[in-house]
Structure formats: C-alpha cells, structure tokens
C-alpha cells in the first residue's frame, strides 16, 4: 500500500510570492497512481484543488482560476508538487495530499 | 462562449508536413487548456495532443509522438500543430477543442467545453 508523507510542517510566503509545497509518496511507483490536492480552509469544509493522474492528465477543480494552482509529479524523487501562485491571504489554509491507488 | 476554427488542413503526400491551427474567440483564452483530436470515417474520435492552460506542459498519443508539435500562443488566442513526417494512416478530420478543467490524454471528450469544426488532413501514399 502507499504512503504519503508532507515533509513541510508550515510554509510562511510574503504575498504575491509564489509557495511549493511537497508530497512524497513511498510504497508504490507514484507514476502509477493518481494524486489529490485538497484545502481546508479555517472554519470551512476540505476543498479539492487539483490532481495529477498516472498518465500525466491534470484536473483542477471548476472555478478556480487556471493560474492558480499548478500540480507535477517527479518519478525521481517520487514527488507530487503543489504550486501556489500569487499568495493571497485567502490561500491561508491546511493542505492535503491523497492517493488513488490505480 | 468561446469559438474554435481550425485551419490548415489539406493533402499532402506521405513524409510530408502540415501545419493546423487553431484560433479562439470569446472568454480569456488562457482560461483553457487545448487539445487536438481527429476521426478517421468510420473510427472513434481519438485524442492527439494536448496543451495545458499555460502552456508549460504537452501530451501526445503515442502514435504521433516524435511527429507531431502542440504549441500556443495565449496573446494571439491560437493553438497550432505541427505535423512532420505524415503517414496515410493520419488521414482524418482534426478537431481542436477547450477545457475548463482538464488537461491531458486521460481528459474525456465530454470534459472538453468547446469544439471547433474540423480540419480535413488528407495523407496519399
């Protein structure tokens, strides 16, 4: 079965700066496997973002700008990553990587 | 409500090359991702590359990679592919079409928004 860690407790950005944050999946080839970016934002409901299937294909989800988020996967590193662009205060939020094992 | 006319197509002899373009009229162009897909008579419609909402990301089907080049240019509201190296077996209609929501060879012909018409490309042996 796989396993996701997120190495980065906290990630502090100065706004309009842009933020990376990480998730390294071990246990399973990441290239066969789809992954899940989710948000929860204080005092709201968890959010899904955007994801990266085992092909390559990435699906965000409707409504946020296309800009926004950007999600790649490195097989080197067995890595998904998250980039935030243009922080705002309303990317105050706790992220979360997921696994669709295929 | 966006509007995708292709252009480009046409005969040409096998190992030659084309150049299909794609041009976008409506809302924010770089609001999509892009993708080409073709339909030979009597065949499923079956995707052929793809392009993400910036740009920095390109997918093929393997039967084109190596041949064929998605590129776009978000100031001019166009998605264009080169094709090299044509074979008989890439004759069909090429259709460009625009997604919200997904880019890649996995996005389903109904998550694409928007389809343009269609270009005839014609490949004689």
């Known amino acids: 079965a796989g396993h996701l860690e997120q190495p980065q407790i906290s990630s502090t950005k100065t706004l309009s700066k842009t933020a990376r944050l990480e998730c390294v999946v071990s246990g399973i080839t990441i290239s066969a496997t789809s992954v899940y970016w989710y948000r929860e934002r204080p005092g709201e409901v968890i959010q899904f973002l955007v994801s990266i299937s085992y092909d390559g294909t990435v699906r965000k989800e409707s409504g946020i700008p296309s800009g926004k988020f950007e999600v790649d996967r490195i097989p080197e590193t067995s890595t998904s990553t998250l980039t935030i662009h243009n922080v705002e205060k309303q990317d105050i939020a706790t992220y979360y990587c997921a696994l669709w094992e295929v | 409500e966006v509007q995708l006319v292709e252009s480009g197509g046409g005969l040409v002899q096998a190992g030659g090359s084309l150049r299909l373009s794609c041009t976008a009229s409506?809302?924010?162009?770089?609001?999509?991702?892009m993708g080409w897909f073709r339909q030979a008579p009597g065949k499923e419609r079956e995707f052929v590359a793809a392009?993400?909402?910036?740009?920095?990301?390109?997918y093929y089907a393997d039967s084109v990679k190596g041949r064929f080049t998605i590129s776009r240019d978000n100031a001019k509201n166009t998605v264009s592919l080169q094709m090299n190296s044509l074979k008989p077996e890439d004759t069909a209609v090429y259709f460009c079409?625009?997604?919200?929501?997904?880019?890649?060879?996995?996005?389903?012909?109904?998550?694409?928004?928007?389809w343009g018409q269609g270009t005839q490309v014609t490949v004689s042996s």
């Open positions: 392009i993400s909402w910036s740009g920095g990301t390109t």
């Open positions: 079409a625009a997604s919200l929501d997904c880019s890649g060879p996995g996005c389903h012909t109904a998550e694409y928004d928007y």
């Open positions: 409506g809302r924010t162009f770089s609001s999509y991702a």
